[in-house]
Interface confidence: medium
């Protein structure tokens, strides 16, 4: 069995303010079991954007049915983008445990925000 890869196919996404941004992420294996989380930025100060397992993220929706056991697409859509949302977003696979532990991160997708068309 090949080791799971986290694929973020887009190095960058550019979105107009007020629109929704779709950030793509797929994994290549169902093993190991564990949730996906999305973060903005890297390191200790990174900001949690979405947690598949728990939490309330009103601006984030999943593109596919991420609750299904066999799902391998963890792309998200973030609504009503503002300039404050600019940054690099990482899709991160966790291994199930107590607590869950980080297993592998995608390469990142840089979100840039264009001015709202007048």
């Amino acid at each position: 069995e090949e080791e799971l890869q986290v694929i973020q196919p887009d190095k960058s996404v550019s979105v107009a303010a007020g629109e929704s941004a779709i950030l793509h992420c797929t994994v290549t294996s169902l093993i190991p079991v564990g949730p996906i989380q999305w973060f903005r930025g890297a390191g200790p100060a990174r900001e949690l954007i979405y947690n598949q397992k728990e939490g309330h993220f009103p601006r984030v929706t999943t593109v596919s049915e991420s609750t299904k056991r066999e799902n391998m697409d963890f792309s998200i859509s973030i609504s009503n983008i503002t300039p404050a949302d600019a940054g690099t977003y990482y899709c991160v696979k966790f291994r199930k445990g107590s607590p869950d532990t980080e297993f592998k991160s995608g390469a990142g997708t840089e979100l840039s925000v264009r001015a709202k068309p007048s």
Epitope: I7, Q8, P9, K11, A107, G108, T109, E110, S112
Partner: antibody, heavy 118, light 108 residues
């Protein structure tokens, strides 16, 4: 007209370093992800490294990871590739390539030749 | 890493004939495949993207087809300027981006 002009190639010894530059004109440089692709003598094409439109995400081929660094200066419309710890197998023409909306290459420079020889 | 295998390595044809070039991927790449032409001493030029869409300024004698793992570039009625090396490239799965080994189309 879109133009990409590489410079900085030359003859170096194994273990030495170089910095390649790619001057871009004829398009909005900061709207495009960019890549370097190389071609060894008599060989095919090999993608080397890519960078997102603001520089927040960089990707590398395994063969150069840890030895090469891609960067960009959007104020100067210039893409860079720093080559460290050069090996004889790094001998190639290095092309700067503009990425279209997805990760294929719609414009290429004419290339700059790097020769690593003792 | 997705490996792209191009065949044949060399295709010997006469002007006016049709060239059929194959590119096979080791994994499903959906329609995320491009074709490039390279002439000696020149940079590659984009011909086809998304497996079947012609790039700007590319004549309609160049056509691409396929999806998943099997792709074909067809050059109908070969012109003298079409004799070159052709490369396929997969994209859309993140790094590393990979190219096929190339097919040389030469004059018979």
């Amino acid at each position: 007209d879109v133009q990409l002009v590489e410079s900085g190639g030359g003859v170096v010894r194994p273990g030495e370093s170089l910095r390649l530059s790619c001057a871009a004109s004829g398009f909005t440089f900061s709207d495009h992800d960019m890549s370097w692709v190389r071609q060894g003598p008599g060989e095919g094409l090999e993608w080397v490294a890519g960078i997102s439109l603001r520089g927040g995400v960089t990707w590398y081929a395994d063969s150069v990871k840890g030895r090469f660094t891609i960067s960009r200066d959007n104020s100067k419309n210039t893409l860079y590739l720093r080559l460290f710890s050069l090996r004889t197998e790094d001998t190639a023409i290095y092309y700067c390539a503009r990425e279209s909306w997805n990760t294929f290459f719609d414009y290429w420079g004419l290339g700059t030749l790097v020769t690593v020889s003792s | 890493e997705i490996v792209l295998t191009q065949s044949p390595g060399t295709l010997s044809l006469s002007p006016g004939e049709t060239a059929t070039l194959s590119c096979r991927a080791s994994q499903n790449v959906r329609s995320n495949l491009a074709w490039y032409q390279q002439k000696p001493g020149q940079a590659p030029r984009l011909l086809i993207y998304d497996a079947s869409s012609r790039a700007t300024g590319i004549p309609d004698r160049f056509s691409g087809s396929g999806s998943g793992t099997d792709f074909t570039l067809t050059i109908s009625s070969l012109q003298s300027e079409d004799f070159a090396v052709y490369y396929c490239q997969q994209y859309g799965n993140g790094p590393p981006l990979t190219f096929g080994g190339g097919t040389k189309v030469e004059i018979k």
